[in-house]
């Protein structure tokens, strides 16, 4: 029942933490513009990976997309690598551990398919998580270089007047996102696999002792609990005890979504 | 069509206050910040704050800090604006005006003459 | 705050000529998040509520006369008519709304001769 608990929550945290990463990476505010000394702004600027933003205090919105592959900085091709494929592979996740839930029955598959699949999805949950801690991370990385380099240059101009401003970008609601959802993933990974290990138990393997008894000739071999380390496919003298009545509780999550040139 | 009618012009004595009008149609009233702007005879023009009556909120210009308060009415679509402790220096034409995309005042009141004198 | 420099304070032309007044601010009105600059230019007829004619300084409000032709970036920004008319009379005044307090610049009267 434990196992079946710690894969269930597992799956539940990792389908909101890739739910999460989907709505991070979609998200048009991965940076938004420092209003250090001036909270109220005539005009806001926004940027995300795909499209950057400018609000007016008018409520007027545009947005504009990178229409260009080759003109953008490595970086933010990087942290779009980085995001996709921690998506492609929680998803991959996603459907490889609906199949390797205990509660849910296909056909005859056998508990150590089960704790292979399991393990497998743990795997790629963990590594999901941290492909998108690790783009936002450098995301954020890029922005804090980028904020004091602009900082630096900030006041220019002839005999000290001011004639330009530079915008000054700080961390988006996205980054926070993509970091919470990058760790909820990780976590609800760890928890697959550790559930793996309860769904697979060690196994011990009893040689088959022969007793000769006068007159008879009866061979006794004890039907002791053989249970496979979760890679073998042995399934003879197998024996499993749940500790009592299934429950199988169908938790479901719905992801809440929220909003370089 | 958009239109923005403001009340009629007032007199008054220094250091009494006033509160001016400005009813909205053809819009969505709650939706649009409304602007207030002073014109002294003769002179140029001078923002005097905003309000969003939506929610409430309000940027001011430092300068009419204290002597200006914007208020709106959803119900009734009318923007307010309260002139306090009035001097010949706030003898003036008073207009309101919506605020549309590009951050520009679209439409504008006739204006509200307000005379300060005793 | 942004301070709005406009020159000359006035100027006299005769119908069908062509005329160009200017604007500076004390910063930038460039946003570089949509290189839009936020300048905006208004007419005011005598006894009237000023109109709207220009925004984002070059974007022409809709039922706007072609002749009026807003131009310039970052600092300095000009309007111009190509061929006044007699119903150009009027006082022109631009507008920071880039940032907070909104200003106006000081004006140009255009007479007609």
């Known amino acids: 029942m434990a196992v079946t608990a710690c894969q269930g929550l597992g799956f539940v945290v990792s389908l909101i933490g890739i739910a999460g990463i989907i709505a991070a990476t979609c998200m048009d505010q991965w940076s938004t513009q420092d209003l250090y000394n001036n909270p109220v702004t005539a005009v806001f600027n926004y940027q995300g990976l795909w499209r950057s933003c400018v609000r007016e205090s008018s409520g007027f919105t545009e947005c504009r997309g990178y229409f260009t592959l080759l003109g953008l900085p490595a970086m933010l091709q990087a942290v779009r690598a980085l995001m996709i494929v921690g998506i492609v592979l929680g998803a991959i996740g996603l459907l490889v551990s609906i199949f390797a839930l205990k509660c849910i029955r296909i056909g005859s598959m056998e508990d150590s398919a089960k704790a292979n699949m399991t393990l497998t999805s743990g795997i790629m949950f963990i590594v999901s998580g941290l492909c998108a801690i690790a783009g936002v991370s450098v995301f954020a990385n890029m922005l804090v270089t980028n904020f004091w380099m602009s900082t630096a240059n900030m006041y220019t101009g002839m005999g000290g007047m001011v004639q330009t401003v530079q915008t000054r970008y700080t961390f988006g609601a996205a980054l926070f996102v993509g970091w919470v959802a990058g760790g909820l993933t990780l976590i609800g990974g760890v928890m697959m696999c550790i559930a793996c290990r309860g769904l697979a138990p060690e196994e011990t393997n009893y040689k088959a002792v022969s007793y000769h008894a006068s007159g008879h000739s009866v061979a006794y071999k004890p039907g002791g609990f053989k249970a496979s380390t979760g890679f073998g496919s042995n399934t003879k003298n197998k024996k499993i005890y749940d500790g009592g009545a299934r429950t199988e509780d169908e938790v479901q999550s719905y992801p809440s979504k929220h909003d370089y040139v | 069509q958009v239109q923005l009618q403001q009340s009629g012009a007032e007199l008054v004595k220094p250091g009494a206050s006033v509160k001016i009008s400005c009813k909205a149609s053809g819009y969505a009233f709650s939706n649009y910040w409304m602007n207030w702007v002073k014109q002294r005879p003769g002179k140029g023009l001078e923002w005097i704050g905003q309000?969003?009556?939506?929610?409430?909120?309000?940027n001011y210009n430092g300068g009419f800090k204290g002597k200006a308060t914007l208020t709106a009415d959803k119900s009734s679509s009318t923007a307010y604006m309260h002139l306090n402790s009035l001097t010949s220096e706030d003898s003036a034409v008073y207009f309101c005006a919506r605020w549309g995309t590009g951050n520009t005042m679209d439409y504008w009141g006739q204006g509200t003459s307000v005379t300060v004198s005793s | 705050d942004i301070v709005m420099t406009q020159s000359p304070s006035s100027l006299t032309v005769t119908a069908g000529e062509k005329v160009t007044m200017s604007c500076k601010s004390s910063q930038s009105l460039l946003n570089s998040g949509n290189q839009k600059n936020y300048l905006t230019w208004y007419q005011q007829k005598p006894g009237q509520p000023p109109k709207l004619l220009i925004y984002?300084?070059?974007t022409r409000e809709s039922g706007v006369p072609d002749r009026f032709t807003g131009s310039g970036s970052g600092t300095d920004f000009t309007l111009t008519i190509s061929s006044v008319q007699a119903e150009d009379l009027a006082v022109y005044y631009c507008?920071?709304?880039?940032?907070?307090?909104?200003?106006f610049g000081s004006g140009t009267k255009l007479e007609i001769k």
């Open positions: 984002w300084a070059s």
């Open positions: 309000i969003y009556p939506g929610n409430g909120n309000t």
């Open positions: 507008q920071n709304v880039y940032s907070y307090p909104i200003t």
